[in-house]
Amino acid sequence: ALDTNYCFSSTEKNCCVRQLYIDFRKDLGWKWIHEPKGYHANFCLGPCPYIWSLDTQYSKVLALYNQHNPGASAAPCCVPQALEPLPIVYYVGRKPKVEQLSNMIVRSCKCS
Amino acid sequence: ALDTNYCFSSTEKNCCVRQLYIDFRKDLGWKWIHEPKGYHANFCLGPCPYIWSLDTQYSKVLALYNQHNPGASAAPCCVPQALEPLPIVYYVGRKPKVEQLSNMIVRSCKCS
């Protein structure tokens, strides 16, 4: 699986999950989140050669098409597969609130 | 929706479904499919600017990150959303067989 365990400990050039830290204020302009100040969101990057963790029958076909037509602009793309939630604390006035923001952290990628 | 109805009738530069015809023999090297000789597989292409048909909370966050950090390599990617099956005929010896190949045709795209 193209997950953090594999990708973070390798020098994989193909589609893999990469490290990305997002600072809520600096990178998103969000002042409303109190804690954390930012988080390891990660992102997916890398080419999707035939056959590299392909998602559907279509993406397998497209990768094969790409192999036969190397100059083509039609190719699978490296995108998130498994996403995890992020617990945050924000204030409503003086009152702290805890919320789980769903689908915020990329744990693994796929070629789609 | 970034579907064939919208995308094929517009000059949309952003993420949209594009026309792609795949010839089974020429483009995939597949000789085993008798009918059809090829099919309109389509593909997804185009940038995913803030905020363009984003898929999850993560892709919205990433697009917003990208707007604040234009030089970053972390960005959502245009990938298939709705896929449809393709009916094919192939021969087992002299005997024709009809099969539905699932997830073969792209009907719409999303930024993931």
Epitope: G29, K31, Y91, R94 | Y50
Partner: antibody
Framework: DVQLVESGGDLVKPGGSLRLTCVAS????????MHWVRQAPGKGLQWVAY????????YYADSVKGRFTISIDNSKNTLYLQMNSLKTEDTATYYC?????????????WGQGTLVTVSS | ETVLTQSPGTLSLSPGERATLSCRAS???????LAWYQQKPGQAPRLLIY???SRAPGVPARFSGSGSGTDFTLTISSLEPEDFAVYYC?????????FGQGTKLEIK
Amino acid sequence: DVQLVESGGDLVKPGGSLRLTCVASGYTFSSNVMHWVRQAPGKGLQWVAYVIPIVDIAYYADSVKGRFTISIDNSKNTLYLQMNSLKTEDTATYYCARTLGLVLDAMDYWGQGTLVTVSS
Amino acid sequence: ETVLTQSPGTLSLSPGERATLSCRASQSLGSSYLAWYQQKPGQAPRLLIYGASSRAPGVPARFSGSGSGTDFTLTISSLEPEDFAVYYCQQYADSPITFGQGTKLEIK
């Protein structure tokens, strides 16, 4: 230049529905919490609802809870207020406003307002 | 909910005079959860002061805010003709956000 422009206000009968729209421009829309505030004719200001963009956390004043829905279309930089089961006491000019940054905060930019009249 | 009471209801003064507007909260707001707005007929409110004492961008220096706890004051040091309007205080310490009933500042 930051601009908020409301529309959708109209004359409606009690029990009717209306959708207000607020289009934002001149800033990164998804960075600020958005509010609706109303003002009955000749009266003071009353907070109605807020929504946090992208994460879609929303909260309502007790007087509108269950009848009004605040929502956002991030792709269109647009804030909405869907108003159902309207009452005569909902008659007011409705303003959209953005906060300085926190969920509850001072509101630094306001739209010009759109008038909703509920009357039979 | 927190009730804000503004006084006086109407204040009649002349240009050049000093205006002092009061806002009292039914419970303590701390020192930084109060804002002041100016509203002219047919217009939207305009933010003047936030955090009890910080001037919003573009607001003239003649406007100042002070106070903490339950008692807050908006002062206009020397009234200009364009200052005659209705002024509202707003608290954002607790949900729901509430506004005072307003003070009308009129020309004497």
